[in-house]
Amino acid sequence: MMTGTIETTGNISAEKGGSIILQCHLSSTTAQVTQVNWEQQDQLLAICNADLGWHISPSFKDRVAPGPGLGLTLQSLTVNDTGEYFCIYHTYPDGTYTGRIFLEVLESSVAEHGARFQIPHHHHHH
């Protein structure tokens, strides 16, 4: 039975040209995390593999940085970065846990972070 939950940074906003940290945290499970994938809609941004470390997708290397922790830092934000981001935790033996973050990149300087909140976990067995 999958007991884990993912906590994310939730709905967040940031200013154009700035940076933002995307964070997820998996709790309430003793499952071993084998890999975390970070995705933006239909593109894989980066992976952190327990054995092999961090790897950033070649098309994002210039403005995506690993961390802190299992999180991801997006730099030089543009309005095109607005949208959904997903952290996908591959675990053993549970399977896959997915967290969702919505980022809005604003033209003005009124951007502010949303509060952290719990989201229901989605899971798919491999």
Epitope: N37, Q43, L52, H55, P58
Partner: antibody, heavy 117, light 107 residues
Framework: EVQLVQSGAEVKKPGASVKVSCKAS????????IEWVRQAPGQRLEWMGV????????NYKEKFKGRVTITADKSSSTAYMELSSLRSEDTAVYYC??????????WGQGTTVTVSS | DIVMTQSPDSLAVSLGERATINCKAS??????VAWYQHKPGQSPKLLIY???YRYTGVPDRFSGSGSGTDFTLTISSLQAEDVAVYYC?????????FGGGTKVEIK
């Protein structure tokens, strides 16, 4: 120029072990993964495992766990793949490749391993 | 493990005509798919990475598309030197499984 040069062909008896080397040159050895892929006659390419030469971290396909060992010697920029308890089905061409995780951009020339009694 | 299923197994195309190869993943792999060309007696060569990015030096007649579970490699105008076996491979999670290959020949 990036190059991966593999050791020569091997003929082994069932139950024996084989160790294939892959010498890298033309790039920073510890900045890329080294992946191992094989192709048995008439079969698809099969991923076997990978090493991060910088950290020494390895990841193996489940079917090879306990039978394959991938290592890397940073001082000589050489990776090794050792496969034990050989059987006839292990007859294949074994390739090393430089990995960016998201793709394998340079490949060795391949090493033919024949397992026969 | 993620299973990559290629179709067709083989393809005969006239010189200058379009060749299309499909690859289906057994589960979501985002855009983490690469395509390789493998000629007899040679090592595989990278053509496409991240589903649609052409690798350095690869002719622009090769293109890739797709995301999620369905992917396509297209050779827009087949040349004699394109005769080979083509493989897709997923890099979404280990083990980095390959498709079964598609043999492309001249009709």
């Amino acid at each position: 120029e990036v190059q991966l040069v593999q050791s020569g062909a091997e003929v082994k008896k069932p139950g024996a072990s084989v160790k294939v080397s892959c010498k890298a040159s033309g790039y920073a050895f510890t900045n890329y993964l080294i992946e191992w892929v094989r192709q048995a006659p008439g079969q698809r390419l099969e991923w076997m495992g990978v090493i991060n030469p910088g950290s020494g971290g390895t990841n193996y396909k489940e079917k090879f766990k306990g039978r394959v060992t991938i290592t890397a010697d940073k001082s000589s920029s050489t990776a090794y793949m050792e496969l034990s308890s050989l059987r006839s089905e292990d007859t294949a061409v074994y390739y090393c490749a430089r990995g960016e995780y998201f793709f394998f951009d340079y490949w060795g020339q391949g090493t033919t391993v024949t397992v026969s009694s | 493990d993620i299973v990559m299923t290629q179709s067709p197994d083989s393809l005969a195309v006239s010189l200058g005509e379009r060749a299309t190869i499909n690859c289906k993943a057994s589960q979501h792999v985002s855009n983490a798919v690469a395509w390789y060309q493998h000629k007899p007696g040679q090592s595989p060569k990278l053509l496409i990475y991240s589903a649609s990015y052409r690798y350095t030096g690869v002719p622009d007649r090769f293109s890739g598309s797709g995301s999620g579970t369905d992917f396509t490699l297209t050779i827009s105008s087949l040349q004699a030197e394109d005769v080979a076996v083509y493989y897709c491979q997923q890099h979404y999670n280990t083990p980095h499984t390959f498709g079964g290959g598609t043999k492309v020949e001249i009709k």
